[in-house]
Interface confidence: low
């Protein structure tokens, strides 16, 4: 779509694939910037899609840590990075991959 892409400014989480479905970090995570960012006006909002470790990620622990990633900024923003699973919900792109 052009314009600034947060994934360009923040480091990739290597060897990780994101959750199968977009999901906010759990309440146990130290910091969720999505709670601090006001949703933008958008026809097709997306919740954040934090990464989860490979292989055989545990669906009960969608993020390998409570650490900050660019996905934490994606609340209310269409799209988002990350390759996900067969859920039928949310973002399914690998980290670092551009949409068509």
């Amino acid at each position: 779509d052009g314009g600034f892409d947060l994934s360009d400014a923040l480091p990739d989480n290597e060897n990780k694939k994101p959750t199968a479905i977009p999901k906010k970090p759990s309440a146990g995570d130290d910091f969720d910037l999505g709670d601090a960012v006001v949703d933008g006006e958008n026809d097709d909002p997306r919740p954040p899609n934090p990464p989860k470790p490979m292989p055989n990620p545990n669906p009960n622990h969608p993020s390998s840590s409570g650490s900050f990633s660019d996905a934490d900024l994606a609340d209310g923003v269409s799209g988002g990075e990350g390759k996900g699973g067969s859920d039928g919900g949310g973002s399914h792109r690998k980290e670092g991959e551009e949409a068509d």
Epitope: P59, G79, G85, S86
Partner: antibody, heavy 120, light 112 residues
Framework: QVQLQQSGPGLVKPSQTLSLTCAIS??????????WNWIRQSPSRGLEWLGR?????????DYAVSVKSRITINPDTSKNQFSLQLNSVTPEDTAVYYC??????????WGQGTTVTVSS | NFMLTQPHSVSESPGKTVTISCTGS????????VQWYQQRPGSAPTTVIY?????PSGVPDRFSGSLDTSSNSASLTISGLRPEDEADYYC??????????FGGGTKVTVLS
């Protein structure tokens, strides 16, 4: 184990509204780790995804462009189910309609399917 | 519009191996997970492969999934073909808006 039980009429008249319901057992429609889809299948179109609803602190809906102007998918948390409404149907909407759950680390889990015929 | 293209049909004798391809029309097939569903006549689809190459419990290891980035395609391979494998098989992935996309389906016939 998640199971989806579909219900709704098998015959709808042209220009009317198709309404189907999918009752969920073994999971919650409000789950933060699931999405709830409607898919249809016809000989002419094959498998066609229609849309989904999912909850991530608030409810989200996504719809296929082909039906966006006339589809509504609603969750019903009190009954743990979700519904499909497709307005202004034509004979081209005749198909087998499936509800399906997507979740972490699995493929779609499908309902049993409901054959819907649009005819006067 | 992003599309997934599958061969209309494949056939092979029992005990042999069949491979079904699923080619993405644009972008990289590797940028989105691919699922495979088996559908027997009169039944709803069931998952045989999810997330490119993962098998659900209960699915025999005769079923395997893979990606080939050079041909921008995913493949489902069924080895040691059995009569009960006769069914339609659908690949599924996502477009650039994260919407679900299905392939057109491949009919697998087990020759007698």
């Amino acid at each position: 184990q998640v199971q989806l039980q579909q219900s709704g009429p098998g015959l709808v008249k042209p220009s009317q509204t198709l309404s189907l319901t999918c009752a969920i057992s073994g999971d919650s429609v409000s789950s933060n780790s699931a999405a709830w889809n409607w898919i249809r299948q016809s000989p002419s179109r094959g498998l066609e995804w229609l849309g989904r609803t999912y909850y991530r602190s608030k409810w989200y809906n996504d719809y296929a462009v082909s039906v966006k102007s006339r589809i509504t998918i609603n969750p019903d948390t009190s009954k743990n189910q979700f519904s499909l409404q497709l307005n202004s149907v034509t004979p081209e909407d005749t198909a087998v309609y499936y509800c399906a759950r997507g979740s972490y680390g699995s493929g779609l889990v499908w309902g049993q399917g409901t054959t819907v015929t649009v005819s006067s | 519009n992003f599309m997934l293209t599958q061969p209309h049909s494949v056939s092979e004798s029992p005990g042999k191996t069949v491979t079904i391809s699923c080619t993405g029309s644009s972008g990289s097939i590797a940028s989105n997970y691919v699922q495979w569903y088996q559908q027997r006549p009169g039944s709803a689809p069931t998952t045989v492969i999810y997330e490119d190459d993962q098998r659900p419990s209960g699915v025999p290891d005769r079923f395997s999934g893979s990606l080939d980035t050079s041909s921008n395609s995913a493949s489902l391979t069924i080895s040691g073909l059995r009569p009960e494998d006769e069914a339609d098989y659908y690949c599924q992935s996502y477009d650039n808006k994260d919407n679900v996309v299905f392939g057109g389906g491949t009919k697998v016939t087990v020759l007698s």
